[in-house]
Interface confidence: medium
């Protein structure tokens, strides 16, 4: 028989981790593997039909994607949808496929909302998801004794899929649920330096453990301003939520990773500022199969998709699509063996959930909600060389933090700063001397109202739903 996979991904724009130029070669490799294995879908031919999730402008679209999905559904009656990856594109498609009872498999759609499988029934996420980042951050807080307060800053990028908005959403909700701590969150506009200064004054009043989701350049600028403002690593720690490790990518990712370095005359200060910085990324798979897969992926992309694939963590997404597709093929094979059909979406999906699988990305564990357990790395600066290296890995399956031998977290005072200052944020503890700004003076300098619409405390409601800003 014939089994049709309907692809709804960006076909023209190659900048997304789930662009077809990146995922296409991974699909080819997965299908070649299915064909080569007699135990997978024996007697079946798998074909792909392509549809774009982009608007005419070449960006992810919450209008184009569902229209494409409808066209593919009625024209080809696919057994499974692959993609979309973008949050705004995946949301309506996921609701349609749930209604049609057709499985949707993606390695994108990382937003918290897709975890609601009542709304997104039969949606399986074989890639990372932001709630899992919250698991990592919660484990980190437990390890370091931060159980009261955290602050999250995130950049608003107009006309975008709002990656930082959704990263923060997953982190915020999961950390709050896991630890029952206070998590404040502030949105800011990238590029507005005056605003950054105001932002850092708020930081002084609201946090010592700060998570920042922004571009590498913005993070560096904020670190420089923090140094200028006296927010040093003795009292503060700034985590850059740089999941794909863009700030760590030197030439081919092999040079010493110095995210503070720009050769712009500010490197000395930036180096000093980054003593207070740490970077959170996805963990690069370290199994030999992944390296071998990357080699094939890159060559296939170049020869058959006319696309030159760079090195980096972004390649874990095509790899996750590859593993997801093989997991799907396994689930269909099992469903058929038990008398089911390729259109039995519920049965196929259930066979993909709550199971482990050895893929090119290594050991892959799907949770009982159909979302992949995700591994993360924490990078810290070697004070000797200024190079960042992995000091801790988080194993999503075991929920354990694993230290990298020979590498320790670098704290200027030899220990992590407390998440709440000894005397409170406003020196409110009467036992302490009022040697910093008083509450009144601080409020005169800045209030939430002063920041106007640019700095908006996001509500839980916002974090649950996929609203454009």
């Amino acid at each position: 028989g014939n089994l049709t996979v309907a692809v709804v991904l960006p076909l023209a724009n190659t900048s997304y981790p789930w662009s077809w130029a990146r995922v296409g070669p991974a699909v080819e490799l997965a299908l070649a593997k299915v064909k080569a294995r007699p135990d997978l879908l024996p007697g079946w031919t798998v074909r792909t039909v392509l549809g774009s999730s982009e608007s005419a402008l070449g960006v992810c679209s919450d209008t184009a994607a569902p229209l494409t999905a409808v066209d593919l559904k009625w024209e080809h009656n696919p057994a499974v949808f692959l993609g979309p990856g973008c949050v705004y594109a995946a949301a309506p498609v996921g609701r349609f496929t749930a209604h049609w009872r057709v499985p949707l498999l993606t390695a994108g759609a990382p937003a918290l909302g897709f975890g609601a499988k009542d709304e997104y029934a039969l949606t399986t996420r074989a890639g990372p998801s932001h709630a899992k980042l919250g698991d990592f951050v919660a484990a980190l807080h437990r390890r370091l004794g931060w159980e009261r307060q955290a602050l999250v800053l995130y950049a608003y990028q107009p006309g975008d899929d709002q990656p930082c908005f959704f990263v923060v959403g997953g982190l915020y909700m999961r950390v709050r649920d896991r630890l029952n701590i206070t998590v404040d969150h502030l949105e800011f506009a990238e590029g507005d330096r005056d605003h950054y200064t105001l932002l850092l004054r708020t930081v002084r009043r609201k946090g010592r453990v700060i998570y920042i989701c922004s571009s590498p350049d913005t993070f560096r600028t904020l670190m420089l301003l923090a140094l200028e403002a006296g927010l040093s690593g003795e009292d503060y720690v700034f985590f850059h939520l740089d999941l794909f490790g863009h700030s760590l990518q030197g030439a081919h990712g092999l040079v010493p990773r110095r995210p503070w370095e720009r050769e712009d005359g500010q490197d000395v200060s930036a180096h000093q500022a980054f003593q207070a910085a740490k970077i959170i990324t996805y963990k690069e798979p370290d199994n030999p199969e992944y390296l071998e897969f990357l080699r094939k992926l890159k060559h296939l992309a170049r020869e058959q998709f006319n696309f030159t694939m760079e090195d980096g963590l972004v390649n874990t997404i095509p790899a996750a699509f590859h593993d997801g597709l093989l997991l799907y093929a396994q689930a269909v094979t099992e469903t058929l063996a038990h008398g089911g059909t390729v259109t039995d979406g519920e049965s196929i999906t259930q066979r993909m959930w709550n199971r482990s699988f050895q893929g090119v990305t290594g050991y892959l564990k799907m949770d009982s909600n159909g979302d992949r357990e995700t591994d993360f790395s924490l990078w810290d600066m070697d004070p000797e060389t200024g190079a960042f290296r992995v000091v801790l890995n988080f194993n999503g399956t075991s929920q354990e933090l694993v230290t990298v031998s020979g590498h320790t977290l670098n704290w200027p005072l030899g220990h992590p700063p407390p998440d709440v200052p000894r005397c409170g944020f406003d020196n409110e503890d009467p036992a302490c001397n009022q040697d910093h700004f008083s509450t009144l003076e601080e409020q005169k300098l800045i209030s939430e109202e002063d920041l106007g619409g640019e700095q908006k405390l996001i509500s839980e409601e916002d974090l649950h739903h996929h609203h454009h800003h």
């Epitope: 080819e28 030439a251 071998e292 990357l294 094939k296 060559h299 020869e303 058959q304 006319n306």
Partner: antibody, heavy 120, light 107 residues
């Protein structure tokens, strides 16, 4: 059994042209990237050119760019190298090579080579 | 273009010896790298691909290691048929480039 048989080599004057052919058998020709590697007498190996299975992509080494053209005829399972404006330094044995992108095996099959001599 | 340097350019060894040849690339090439053996008058033969993967049919006394910029070919228990010239190749990016070769001859 995979076989690659080159032909078309010979003696040619500087500035002249030659067309090399490589007849392939024993594998799915269209699925493979094909290429040419040369070796000057007593010297090392030098990659010359490659072409993808779908004909869309061609690549050339700097010394031959603009003078050599790689092509293939998938219906005839044949690879070609059109060499124009030949120079003395193009004198070499030219090998036809395969590259299976699904396995990642680069240049795993080689022909026996055809000798091109550029001399006046 | 990426430059490949190979060392030594030649070496003399005896049957049963352990031989090590190294290759260095001018920039990081991950594991997009291979080793070839060529005997006089013959076409080269692929020994190792992806830096450390043994091509099928190649004896297990050949092994490859390395990633990034530094790569090694090791021949354990050198056999008479192993006396040949060995070339490394980067296929990380076009133009592909070979190393200058290492000639292994009988001591």
């Amino acid at each position: 059994e995979v076989q690659l048989v080159e032909s078309g080599g010979g003696l040619v004057q500087p500035g002249g042209s030659l067309r090399l052919s490589c007849a392939a058998s024993g594998f799915s020709f269209v699925s493979y990237v094909m290429g040419w590697v040369r070796q000057a007498p007593g010297k090392g190996l030098e990659w010359v050119s490659s072409i993808s299975g779908s004909l869309t992509n061609t690549y050339y080494a700097d010394p031959v760019k603009g003078r050599f053209t790689i092509s293939r005829d998938n219906s005839k399972n044949t690879l070609y190298l059109q060499m124009n404006s030949l120079r003395a330094e193009d004198t070499a044995a030219y090998y036809c090579v395969t590259y299976d992108i699904l396995t990642g095996h680069l240049f795993d099959y080689w022909g026996q080579g055809t000798l091109v001599t550029v001399s006046s | 273009a990426i430059q490949m340097t190979q060392s030594p350019s030649s070496l003399s060894a005896s049957v049963g010896d352990r031989v090590t040849i190294t290759c260095r690339s001018s920039q990081g090439i991950r594991n997009d790298f291979g080793w070839y053996q060529q005997k006089p008058g013959k076409a080269p033969k692929l020994l190792i691909y992806a830096a450390s993967r043994l091509q099928s049919g190649v004896p297990s006394r050949f092994s490859g290691s390395g990633s990034g910029t530094d790569f090694t070919l090791t021949i354990n228990n050198l056999q008479p048929e192993d006396f040949a010239t060995y070339y490394c190749l980067q296929d990380y990016t076009y133009p592909f480039t070979f190393g200058p070769g290492t000639k292994v001859d009988i001591k």
